[in-house]
């Protein structure tokens, strides 16, 4: 029986060009976490395996950093990074727990102000 729950940072926003930490936490279970997969929509971003450590997908290596902990740090954010992110906890003996985070990447305030002043 799966008794655990995933707590996430929920809906978050960050500025374009900045960075953000995606965090999930599994609680209320004694199950052993064997692996955590991080996905963006249908793309595998990174994996943290209890035995093998971190693997970052090559296409994201420049902008994704492991941690802190089982979390994931996204850097040099673009508007295209807006969307759903999933942390998938593989545990033994419970099975799989999934958490969802929605990230909205906003134009930076500097860019917004610049745009305002350019409008006649």
């Amino acid at each position: 029986m799966m008794t655990g729950t995933i707590e996430t940072t929920g809906n978050i926003s960050a500025e374009k060009g900045g960075s953000i930490i995606l965090q999930c936490h599994l609680s209320s279970t004694t199950a052993q976490v064997t692996q955590v997969n991080w996905e963006q929509q249908d793309q595998l971003l990174a994996i943290c395996n209890a035995d093998l450590g971190w693997h970052i997908s090559p296409s994201f290596k420049d902008r994704v950093a492991p941690g802190p902990g089982l979390g994931l740090t996204l850097q040099s954010l673009t508007v295209n990074d807006t969307g759903e992110y999933f942390c998938i906890y593989h545990t033994y003996p419970d099975g799989t727990y999934t958490g969802r985070i929605f990230l909205e990447v906003l134009e930076s305030s500097v860019a917004e102000h610049g745009a305002r002043f350019q409008i006649p």
């Epitope: 064997t34 692996q35 996905e39 249908d42 793309q43 595998l44 994996i47 395996n49 035995d51 093998l52 693997h55 997908s57 296409s59 593989h90 033994y92 003996p93």
Partner: antibody, heavy 118, light 107 residues
């Protein structure tokens, strides 16, 4: 260099048993999940069974469930497949395979042929 | 079980040709799709993992794309050593399943 060396294949009669072994070297065996995959003569690849790095979790294809048992001895760097109640349709080359991050098979053994025939 | 359908089952091509092989899953598998190459009498070899990541040591003429249910393996310029059988495989859930294979033959 990663090496996976299967052994234990051969000719066996229907209803008989065989135990396949896979000796692993060149990597930390206890850190990796492992699979058995088979290939019948002239056919495609079929996943048979998998086991977690510590041996605590196992899974099987429906076609072998209840007849085959996967196990490992991390102190001996060896993976096993105990095959009972063998059938003609189990005839195949059996590959031992290392699984990276539970997602992709990055190394395969050379395979061992199991022939079930009377 | 997730069914993997590969097409075509075989194709004839010449050295230098661009070759595309497709793989379709019976349900969404995110990007949990791998591609392997197998030559007669040999074990399979990993080419692409997680839909689009090139395995270390594999030539850059191989590329993978797709997500969800539809995936593609592309060989940008076919070389003599590329004549082989190619398999896709999903690792989204057990039982792990393979496509039926695509045999790439010399025209």
């Amino acid at each position: 260099e990663v090496q996976l060396l299967e052994s234990g294949g051969g000719l066996v009669q229907p209803g008989g048993s065989l135990r396949l072994s896979c000796a692993a070297s060149g990597f930390t065996f206890s850190s990796y999940a492992m699979h058995w995959v088979r290939q019948a003569p002239g056919k495609g690849l079929e996943w048979v069974s998998g086991i977690s790095s510590n041996g605590g979790s196992t899974s099987y294809a429906d076609s072998v469930k209840g007849r085959f048992t996967i196990s490992r001895d991390n102190s001996k760097n060896t993976l096993y497949l105990q095959m009972n109640s063998l059938r003609a349709e189990d005839t195949a080359v059996y590959y031992c395979a290392r699984v990276a991050y539970s997602v992709w098979i990055d190394y395969w053994g050379q395979g061992t042929l199991v022939t079930v025939s009377s | 079980d997730i069914q993997m359908t590969q097409s075509p089952s075989s194709l004839s091509a010449s050295v230098g040709d661009r070759v595309t092989i497709t793989c379709r899953a019976s349900q969404s598998i995110s990007s949990y799709l791998n591609w392997y190459q197998q030559k007669p009498g040999k074990a399979p070899k990993l080419l692409i993992y997680a839909a689009s990541s090139l395995q270390s040591g594999v030539p850059s003429r191989f590329s993978g794309s797709g997500s969800g249910t539809d995936f593609t393996l592309t060989i940008s310029s076919l070389q003599p050593e590329d004549f082989a059988t190619y398999y896709c495989q999903q690792s989204y859930s057990t039982p792990l399943t393979f496509g039926g294979g695509t045999k790439v033959e010399i025209k």
